[in-house]
């Protein structure tokens, strides 16, 4: 039975030009955290697995940095980063957990961060 | 330039064990996983598990049921992958493969290693 | 475990020919694949990586694109040297696991 819920950093707004941190965290559960794949809509990231290291897609290597932690850092950030990205965390024994994150970039000075939200 | 060579042909028999090396040359060695990759005749590639040099940590395909062990010896920028309790399907060659630096994509491979089971 | 499923497992073609390969996912892979080349008794070759970037040196007649569970490779315009087997491999989630092979042979 999957016990663990994902907190995501929510909704946020970032300025375009700046930079970002993508970030989730897994709890309420024993499960061993075994990869974690971040995700846009309809393409792949970047994937943190335990021992075998990073992957950045060639798309994301030049503005995407590993980190902190499981997260990932997205910078020089365009208008059309604005959407939805996903952290799946692939974990032993319970299987796959996903946490959405919206993020809006803005012309204008003005980005707050949403509040923080659960996805059980 | 890049250059990853394994050691020669074994010939083994059931129930023992084999030990292939990948000694690299051309590239710092701890900045990149190294990967073994087993071709059995006629079958598909199968992926036997990877390693990360640089920590040490590795992820092994469960088919393998703890049979395998691979480990580096950073020094000698050489990877081992060792297979016991051997069987007539093990029969195969034996690939290493590095990928790339922040990269899942397995850019270099070795010339490969035929291990045959048989008594 | 991710089942990659390639189609046809073999074709015959000519030089100048026009070739198509479909690899499918059991399950969701986002962009995570790899094409891979390989001739008789040697080890595979890199061509495609995520899933439509083309590796260093390899000629503009490969591509590949798809995203989810759905990918193809093509060679516009088949030469001698091309006649292979060709593997898509998935690495989204361990193990990772690959096509069972396309052998493209001369008609």
């Known amino acids: 039975m999957m016990t663990g819920t994902i907190e995501t950093t929510g909704n946020i707004s970032a300025e375009k030009g700046g930079s970002i941190i993508l970030q989730c965290h897994l709890s309420s559960t024993t499960a061993q955290v075994t990869q974690v794949n971040w995700e846009q809509q309809d393409q792949l990231l970047a994937i943190c697995n335990a021992d075998l290291g990073w992957h950045i897609s060639p798309s994301f290597k030049d503005r995407v940095a590993p980190g902190p932690g499981l997260g990932l850092t997205l910078q020089s950030l365009t208008v059309n980063d604005t959407g939805e990205y996903f952290c799946i965390y692939h974990t032993y024994p319970d299987g796959t957990y996903t946490g959405r994150i919206f993020l809006e970039v803005l012309e204008s000075s003005v980005a707050e961060h949403g509040a923080r939200f659960q996805i059980p | 330039q890049v250059q990853l060579v394994q050691s020669g042909a074994e010939v083994v028999k059931p129930g023992a064990s084999v030990k292939v090396s990948c000694k690299t040359s051309?590239?710092?060695?701890?900045?990149?996983?190294m990967h073994w990759v087993k071709q059995a005749p006629g079958q598909r590639l199968e992926w036997i598990g990877g390693i990360n040099p640089n920590q040490g940590g590795n992820r092994n395909n469960q088919k393998f049921k703890g049979r395998v062990t691979i480990t580096v010896d950073t020094s000698a920028s050489t990877a081992y992958m060792e297979l016991s309790s051997l069987r007539s399907e093990d029969s195969a060659v034996y690939y290493c493969a590095r990928s790339g630096l922040r990269d899942y994509a397995m850019d270099y491979w070795g010339q490969g290693t035929l291990v045959t089971v048989s008594s | 475990d991710i089942q990659m499923t390639q189609s046809p497992s073999s074709l015959s073609t000519s030089v100048g020919d026009r070739v198509t390969i479909t690899c499918k996912a059991s399950q969701h892979v986002s962009t995570a694949v790899v094409w891979y080349q390989q001739k008789p008794g040697k080890a595979p070759k890199l061509l495609i990586y995520s899933p439509s970037y083309r590796y260093t040196g390899v000629p503009s007649r490969f591509s590949g694109s798809g995203s989810g569970t759905d990918f193809t490779f093509t060679i516009s315009s088949v030469q001698p040297e091309d006649f292979a087997t060709y593997y898509c491999q998935q690495h989204y989630s361990t193990p990772w696991t690959f096509g069972q092979g396309t052998k493209v042979e001369i008609k």
């Open positions: 051309g590239y710092t060695f701890t900045e990149n996983t």
